[in-house]
C-alpha cells in the first residue's frame, strides 16, 4: 500500500481509538452512571490520572491528525517525492502518540490490577488490591462491593476496553511510525497526476 | 490459661491450599456453646475487620510466607473465655466460613 | 432445641432484628451444623445455595429479616446444633443455634 493510503488509513483508525478512549475515560467518572460520587474521594487512583482522556485521547489524537494530513495530497515539493514535511511531522507525533499510548495502557493495566476504590463492610478502599487481579476470575465476590453501585463491573468492562485500545494505538502508532519514516525518505508512491496542478 | 489483663498471640498454620489467596477469620464459641466472629483478614493482610466487643484489644495478621493466620489477644477479660477456630472465607475477602480449623481452648482465669 | 424423629421433616427458623439485605442486593445468609465435637461446617450461603458435598435434603428460603433452613428427611447424622450467620453488615452475628435431636 502507499505510504500516503496507509497514513490515512492509520489515522482515521487512531482517531476513532482516541474518542472511544475519552468517552471510557469520561464513563469511570460517572460509576454506574451516577454523578453522585464523581466529586469525592471515591473513585480510585487510576480514573484521575485520565489515561484515557490524556494518554489515549489527547496524546494520541495529534498522530491521528498528522497521519491523515499526511495521507493528504500535495505539500512542500511536487510530484512523488511531495508530503514530505507532513511524513516527518507523522514520525515525531507517532512517537509521542506511542508514549501516551503506553500511559494509557499503564494506568488501564493498573486499574484493572487493583481493581476500584469501593465500600466493602462499612470501610472505604482498594479492597480487590491485594489480590494481584485474581478478583476478575471470581465475579462472586464483586458484590461485596457496596458503594458506587456496580462499580466493579463498570470499572472493569471500561478499563478493559482502555487497554485494548492502547494497544491498538500502539499498534498503530508504531505502524505509522514506520510508514510515515518510509514516506520521509522515498516519499509517496501516488502517480503525478494525483498531485495537484 | 491466662489471667485477666494478660496477653496471647493465638496462631493458625494453613495447609492444602493457596494461603495467600483466602480472606481468613477468627471465630470463638464460648462455654455457652455461642458462636461469635471476632476478627477477619483480607487474603493480602491489607484489610482487617472486628466487632466492637475486640476492636482495639485483638489484632488479627497473616504471614503468607509461612501460611499462618495469628490472633494477637491483649487485655484479656474473663468473657474472652472460649474455644478458638480459624476458619477460611471462600475468596480474597468477607464471604462464607467453607472451611473451619479444629479449635484451641483459651481459658481467662485468676 | 427441636426434637423429631428419624425420616421425618425438621424446619430450623432464623430471624434477625433488622435486614440482612446487602446493598448489592444480595443477602449473606449461611446456615452451619456443629456436630458433637468437631468444628463447625457450612451447609448452605446465601440463603439457598448448598455448599459442595451437602445432600440436597437441606435446603435454604427466606429474605428480608426471616430465614428457614428444611431438612426433608432427618437422617442420624443430621443432629447437632444449627447455627445461622449473617455475613451481609460488621459485624457479622451468629444465631444463638438450634438443637437437633432424637425426639
Known amino acids: 500500500m502507499c505510504t500516503g493510503k496507509c497514513a490515512r488509513c492509520v489515522g482515521l483508525s487512531l482517531i476513532t481509538l482516541c474518542l472511544v478512549c475519552i468517552v471510557a475515560n469520561a464513563l469511570l467518572l460517572v460509576p454506574n452512571g451516577e454523578t453522585s460520587w464523581t466529586n469525592t474521594n471515591h473513585l480510585s487512583l487510576q480514573v484521575w490520572l485520565m489515561g484515557g482522556f490524556i494518554g489515549g485521547g489527547l496524546m494520541v489524537l495529534c498522530p491521528g491528525i498528522a497521519a491523515v494530513r499526511a495521507g493528504g495530497k500535495g505539500c512542500c515539493g511536487a510530484g512523488c517525492c511531495g508530503n514530505r514535511c507532513r511524513m516527518l511531522r507523522s514520525v515525531f507525533s507517532s512517537a509521542f502518540g506511542v508514549l501516551g499510548a503506553i500511559y494509557c495502557l499503564s494506568v488501564s493495566g493498573a486499574g484493572l490490577r487493583n481493581g476500584p476504590r469501593c465500600l466493602m463492610n462499612g470501610e472505604w478502599g482498594y479492597h480487590f488490591e491485594d489480590t494481584a487481579g485474581a478478583y476478575l476470575l471470581n465475579r462472586t465476590l464483586w458484590d461485596r462491593c457496596e458503594a458506587p453501585p456496580r462499580v466493579v463491573p463498570w470499572n472493569v468492562t471500561l478499563f478493559s476496553l482502555l487497554v485494548a485500545a492502547s494497544c491498538l494505538e500502539i499498534v498503530l502508532c508504531g505502524i505509522q511510525l514506520v510508514n510515515a519514516t518510509i514516506g520521509v525518505f522515498c516519499g509517496d508512491c501516488r502517480k503525478k497526476q494525483d498531485t495537484p496542478h | 490459661l491466662v489471667k485477666p489483663g494478660g496477653s496471647l498471640k493465638l496462631s493458625c498454620a494453613a495447609s492444602g491450599f493457596t494461603f495467600s489467596s483466602y480472606g481468613m477469620s477468627w471465630v470463638r464459641q464460648t462455654p455457652d456453646k455461642r458462636l461469635e466472629w471476632v476478627a477477619t483478614?483480607?487474603?493480602?493482610?491489607?484489610?482487617?475487620y472486628y466487632p466492637d466487643s475486640v476492636k482495639g484489644r485483638f489484632t488479627i495478621s497473616r504471614d503468607n510466607a509461612k501460611n499462618t493466620l495469628y490472633l494477637q489477644m491483649r487485655s484479656l477479660k474473663s468473657e474472652d473465655t472460649a474455644m478458638y477456630y480459624c476458619?477460611?472465607?471462600?475468596?480474597?475477602?468477607?464471604?462464607?466460613?467453607?472451611?473451619w480449623g479444629q479449635g484451641t481452648t483459651l481459658t481467662v482465669s485468676s | 432445641s427441636l426434637p423429631v424423629s428419624l425420616g421425618d421433616q425438621a424446619s430450623i427458623s432464623c430471624r434477625s432484628s433488622q435486614s440482612i439485605l446487602h446493598s448489592s442486593g444480595n443477602t449473606y445468609l449461611e446456615w452451619y451444623l456443629q456436630k458433637p465435637g468437631q468444628s463447625p461446617k457450612l451447609l448452605i450461603y446465601?440463603?439457598?445455595n448448598r455448599f459442595s458435598g451437602v445432600p440436597d435434603r437441606f435446603s435454604g428460603s427466606g429474605s428480608g429479616t426471616d430465614f428457614t433452613l428444611k431438612i426433608s428427611r432427618v437422617e442420624a447424622e443430621d443432629l447437632g446444633v444449627y447455627y445461622c450467620?449473617?455475613?451481609?453488615?460488621?459485624?457479622?452475628?451468629f444465631g444463638s443455634g438450634t438443637k437437633l435431636e432424637i425426639k
Open positions: 476458619a477460611r472465607h471462600e475468596g480474597f475477602t468477607t464471604y462464607y466460613f467453607d472451611y
Open positions: 446465601k440463603v439457598s
Open positions: 450467620f449473617q455475613g451481609s453488615h460488621v459485624p457479622f452475628t
Open positions: 483478614i483480607s487474603s493480602g493482610g491489607g484489610y482487617t
